[in-house]
């Protein structure tokens, strides 16, 4: 059941976002999260993870790109990209004329 | 867009009982700590109490445990506040709080004889 | 009394700079992050600063964190009448095991 929160060994994790109380949290694994809202520049956020692992698996889109790692303060040092978005004139299979 | 919405404050007497809830929509509810955060007329913000993603782990202010207990339903994505033997001094507005950055726009607890 | 310390009021013009100051202990601001948040008149608090020095996006960059040892400050620069507000620091307390906030700065932008 991906609902339900790991109880595995714990890592220490850099937390660097709204929901962190200090520096460093403790979780099952470590997770990086670039999200983009409509109209505003990209924040990425640094934190520990302990359900959805699911999430840890999707592809990156244009507005949001999650990664997680296992080891001890493996979230520090990470930066991430969106999925570049292409103007309808240069997706492939269109000559662009 | 993320959303909290506080419901269940009125009019008590003292020593009495209520259930604050809070509906949460617009973000995964069940990946975010909550918390219950109260300001009395005029006064400053105080944090009352908080539980984590599973609710497996709560907190306490010393002066309301034992009397108040928080709780969560993540099927419902609902926050729950249930406070006991309430006094006077519980008068507040009581607000819903995403850990550590968004908030509901409260709820008013009167407590009068 | 709050565990964290902040002057009552602050006040200026507009178009300056005011900074408020917020001052804990070792097991609050001391060790971990500083968060601060503006309550307009008859509104719910709206988080302005969070890990000390960091906005959050939509929050103008007028406003600015900082932290040393246990004390921390928020800065408004270019000063607007739509500032005049409640200002709160908050930090998680280690011996307190819970939340702690300071008691609040009523910031006044005179005419």
């Known amino acids: 059941d991906p609902v339900k929160p790991s109880r595995g060994p714990l890592v220490t994790c850099t937390c660097e976002s709204p929901h962190c109380k200090g520096p460093t949290c403790r979780g099952a694994w470590c997770t990086v999260v670039l999200v983009r809202e409509e109209g505003r520049h990209p924040q990425e956020h640094r934190g520990c993870g302990n359900l959805h692992r699911e999430l840890c698996r999707g592809r990156p889109t244009e507005f949001v790109n999650h990664y997680c790692c296992d080891s001890h303060l493996c979230n520090h040092n990470v930066s991430l990209v969106l999925e570049a978005t292409q103007p309808p004139s240069e997706q492939p299979g269109t000559d662009g004329q | 867009e993320v959303q909290l919405l506080e419901s269940g404050g009125g009019l008590v007497q003292p020593g009495g009982s209520l259930r604050l809830s809070c509906a949460a929509s617009?973000?995964?509810?069940?990946?975010?700590?909550m918390s219950w955060v109260r300001q009395a007329p005029g006064k400053g913000l105080e944090w009352v109490a908080n539980?984590?993603?599973?609710?497996?782990?709560?907190n306490y202010v010393d002066s309301m445990r034992g009397r108040f207990t928080i709780s969560r339903d993540n099927s419902k994505n609902t926050l729950y506040l249930q406070m006991n033997s309430l006094r006077a001094e519980d008068t507040a507005v009581y607000y819903c709080?995403?850990?550590?950055?968004?908030w509901g726009q409260g709820t008013l607890v009167t407590v009068t004889s | 009394q709050s565990v964290l310390a902040q002057p009552p009021s602050a006040s200026g013009t507009p178009g300056q700079r005011v900074t408020i100051s917020c001052s804990g202990s070792?097991?609050?601001?001391?060790?971990?992050?500083v968060y601060w948040y503006q309550q307009l008149p008859g509104t719910a608090p709206k988080l302005l600063i969070y890990?000390?020095?960091k906005r959050p996006s939509g929050v103008p960059d007028r406003f600015s964190g900082s932290k040393s040892g246990t004390s921390a400050s928020l800065a408004i620069s270019g000063l607007r009448s739509e500032d005049e507000a409640d200002y709160y620091c908050a930090a998680w307390d280690d011996s307190l095991n819970g939340r702690v906030f300071g008691g609040g700065t009523k910031l006044t932008v005179l005419d």
């Open positions: 617009g973000f995964t509810f069940s990946s975010y700590a």
């Open positions: 539980i984590n993603q599973d609710g497996s782990e709560k």
């Open positions: 709080a995403r850990e550590f950055d968004y």
């Open positions: 070792s097991s609050n601001i001391g060790s971990n992050y």
């Open positions: 890990g000390n020095n």
